[in-house]
């Protein structure tokens, strides 16, 4: 998590700040959504439990050419301890259904808000 300084501020970012910034970015995406997000692209849904940040990145990183989520992809990479590339799915990632990116972002946002309220920043 201390690697998050690269895009948000000059030094290491406290976990609470990093999570708040991710939440703010997802709020921006959902509020500024006029046309269907990423043209209706579909991604694998994830279990919002252990390994959630890497799983979310593994799903979203496959979407290319969608500028609206590029910042989210970068931010999620700061939460994931290992490098994630397109087409890579960990054993934590059960591929049982695909959903639209817009729904994925909404689900992730709701869960992150809950974590923030509960003080779970890692």
């Amino acid at each position: 998590l201390t690697c998050l300084g690269g895009f948000a501020s000059p030094g290491p970012v406290p976990p609470s700040t990093a999570l708040r910034e991710l939440i703010e970015e997802l709020v921006n995406i959902t509020q500024n959504q006029k046309a269907p997000l990423c043209n209706g692209s579909m991604v694998w849904s994830i279990n919002l439990t252990a390994g959630m940040y890497c799983a979310a990145l593994e799903s979203l990183i496959n979407v290319s050419g969608c500028s609206a989520i590029e910042k989210t992809q970068r931010m999620l990479s700061g939460f994931c301890p290992h490098k994630v590339s397109a087409g890579q799915f960990s054993s934590l990632h059960v591929r049982d259904t695909k959903i639209e990116v817009a729904q994925f972002v909404k689900d992730l946002l709701l869960h992150l808000k809950k974590l923030f309220r509960e003080g779970q920043f890692n």
Partner: nanobody, 116 residues
Framework: EVQLLESGGGLVQPGGSLRLSCAAS????????MDWVRQAPGKGLEWVSS????????YYADSVKGRFTISRDNSKNTLYLQMNSLRAEDTAVYYC?????????WGQGTLVTVSS
């Protein structure tokens, strides 16, 4: 330019079968995961099935598991969806999609109507 052309839809009775095809061009078909997505009248998009680039990995929505089979022929740049035991709730426009791309890269769809 990516082009996907679906065919094989039509009117079928409950319990019947149909085989949808999707001819792909404009990209290296064998390198990409592919999806079937459907949209029922007045409803949102619903993912149906996905297949990995080689065809060895297949995935299905619970609503079609055991009834639909996705396959591909990379030598013919064609994606298929074999639909058996069709139900009224399968009535929809079925789209072939290059995975992780928006509907700018989807086909025009083929209508499947299940009715007696």
């Amino acid at each position: 330019e990516v082009q996907l052309l679906e065919s094989g839809g039509g009117l079928v009775q409950p319990g019947g079968s149909l085989r949808l095809s999707c001819a792909a061009s404009g990209f290296t078909f064998r390198d990409y995961e592919m999806d079937w997505v459907r949209q029922a009248p007045g409803k949102g998009l619903e993912w149906v099935s996905s297949i990995g680039p080689s065809g060895s990995e297949t995935y299905y929505a619970d609503s079609v598991k055991g009834r639909f089979t996705i396959s591909r022929d990379n030598s013919k740049n064609t994606l298929y969806l074999q639909m058996n035991s069709l139900r009224a709730e399968d009535t929809a426009v079925y789209y072939c999609a290059k995975a992780y791309t928006g509907f700018g890269y989807w086909g025009q769809g083929t209508l499947v109507t299940v009715s007696s």
